[in-house]
């Protein structure tokens, strides 16, 4: 049994880091493998992660972490019984994938303005809480070409757009994702999408 693709890990910078790797053949990850992880920290102790299958030869492990700070460094040991298959390390602050925003809501009752709001996925005491920026994706269910991205570079989790920038009388969907420049993170997953019917009063034409 050998590791074909070494584990790569990403952290949500809160409580979970996810490591994925591939074996050289079909593997029952949960019965054959264990990933031990330990904070490089005086008198810390190792924790065991039981991996799950992620495709035939792929494995994934969700490492539970008690908070994350920038100095954190973990040693990782991948074991198959008594055999050490791979040894490495992981610094969560250098491999951050933020949590996805939630509770995306479209408020359509503000005159002819659409107000989109969502929730910051982090609690106020987490470092990323004040460092997230967002991308909002809006698309038409009827027209695949009607697909747009709005970059929200301020901290408030909301976006206002004129309803008239979208077509009237048709349904739209929106979703939002987050990233943090301070840690050069990857983008989060998209939030679940929300749907609304776009309608607004056309301005009277002057003759």
């Amino acid at each position: 049994m050998k590791v074909l693709q070494e584990p790569t890990c990403v952290s949500d910078y809160m409580s979970i880091s996810t490591c994925e790797w591939k074996m050289n053949g079909p593997t029952n990850c949960s019965t054959e493998l264990r990933l031990l992880y330990q904070l490089v920290f005086l008198l810390s102790e190792a924790h065991t992660c039981i991996p799950e299958n992620n495709g035939g030869a792929g494995c994934v492990c969700h490492l539970l972490m008690d908070d994350v700070v920038s100095a954190d460094n973990y040693t990782l040991d991948l074991w198959a019984g008594q055999q050490l298959l791979w040894k490495g390390s992981f610094k969560p602050s250098e491999h951050v994938k933020p949590r996805a925003p939630g509770n995306l809501t479209v408020h359509t009752n503000v005159s002819d303005t659409l107000l989109l709001t969502w929730s910051n996925p982090y609690p106020p005491d987490n470092y990323l809480y004040n460092h997230l920026t967002y991308a909002v994706n809006i698309w038409s269910e009827n027209d695949p070409a009607d697909f747009r991205i709005y970059n929200v570079t301020y901290l408030e989790p909301s976006l206002r757009i004129a309803a008239s920038t979208l077509k009237s009388g048709i349904s739209y969907r929106a979703r939002v994702r987050a990233w943090a420049q301070c840690y050069n993170t990857t983008w989060s997953e998209w939030s679940p999408s929300t749907k609304w019917h776009n309608s607004y009063r056309e301005p009277f034409e002057q003759h």
């Epitope: 920290f41 005086l42 008198l43 102790e45 008690d66 908070d67 700070v69 100095a71």
Partner: antibody, heavy 120, light 108 residues
Framework: EVQLLESGGGLVQPGGSLRLSCAAS????????MHWVRQAPGKGLEYVSG????????YYANSVKGRFTISRDNPKNTLFLQMSSLRAEDTAVYYC?????????????WGQGTTVTVSS | EIVLTQSPGTLSLSPGERATLSCRAS???????LAWYQQKPGQAPRLLIY???RRATGIPDRFSGSGSGTDFTLTISRLEPEDFAVYYC?????????FGQGTKLEIK
């Protein structure tokens, strides 16, 4: 209420021995690394020794290595420091301290301290 | 072994003023953790800041920590009468624990 209560301090002659105890209440001792920190009269804080949550790993400052032994009895929620070959410079208030991994070495709970005096 | 040097040894200020306490490490500490404690006469120390900049539970927001590498700072934005005490920085690393010698913050 989370508390640490030290006992076992006292007056001892140079070369003598003493065993300090620390009773924990309000939390499960086995979830935390535990440490001893001392403070000589009118001086600053000095780290003495620590032990991992399960007791498998220990650490000692150079000044006490080979003379002091740290141990724990998790079922009884108690930490110990066995001190031998005591010297005058070991005279201090000894604090039992908890370290929460979430606090990354920050010692969030301290006992009130027990005084050890080494003198002839 | 890393040595922590605190400065100044004594800081004399008045209530309402801003206090800046320094802690310098003898070498860089990228994978270690810096904490700050307050100690009043006859009392055990109290954890103020951990992980360089995070306030411990119940610590007022006038206390803040910052720094990286070798230079770290504890700032008290507006001194209250109860803040006059001795302050210690502490390094908790992979292989050792070290305290600074302390800074005494006294009323001017």
């Amino acid at each position: 209420e989370v508390q640490l209560l030290e006992s076992g301090g006292g007056l001892v002659q140079p070369g003598g021995s003493l065993r300090l105890s620390c009773a924990a209440s309000g939390f499960t001792l086995s979830s935390y690394a535990m440490h001893w920190v001392r403070q000589a009269p009118g001086k600053g804080l000095e780290y003495v020794s620590g032990i991992s949550p399960s007791g498998v790993s220990t650490y000692y400052a150079n000044s006490v290595k080979g003379r002091f032994t740290i141990s724990r009895d998790n079922p009884k929620n108690t930490l110990f420091l066995q001190m031998s070959s005591l010297r005058a410079e070991d005279t201090a208030v000894y604090y039992c301290v908890r370290v929460k991994v979430k606090y990354r070495g920050g010692m969030d709970v301290w006992g009130q301290g027990t005084t050890v005096t080494v003198s002839s | 072994e890393i040595v922590l040097t605190q400065s100044p040894g004594t800081l004399s200020l008045s209530p309402g003023e801003r206090a800046t306490l320094s802690c310098r490490a003898s070498q860089g500490i990228s994978s270690a953790y810096l904490a700050w404690y307050q100690q009043k006469p006859g009392q055990a120390p109290r954890l103020l800041i951990y992980g360089t900049s995070r306030r411990a539970t119940g610590i007022p927001d006038r206390f803040s920590g910052s720094g990286s590498g070798t230079d770290f700072t504890l700032t008290i934005s507006r001194l209250e009468p109860e803040d006059f005490a001795v302050y210690y920085c502490q390094l908790y690393g992979a292989t050792s624990v070290t305290f600074g010698q302390g800074t005494k913050l006294e009323i001017k």
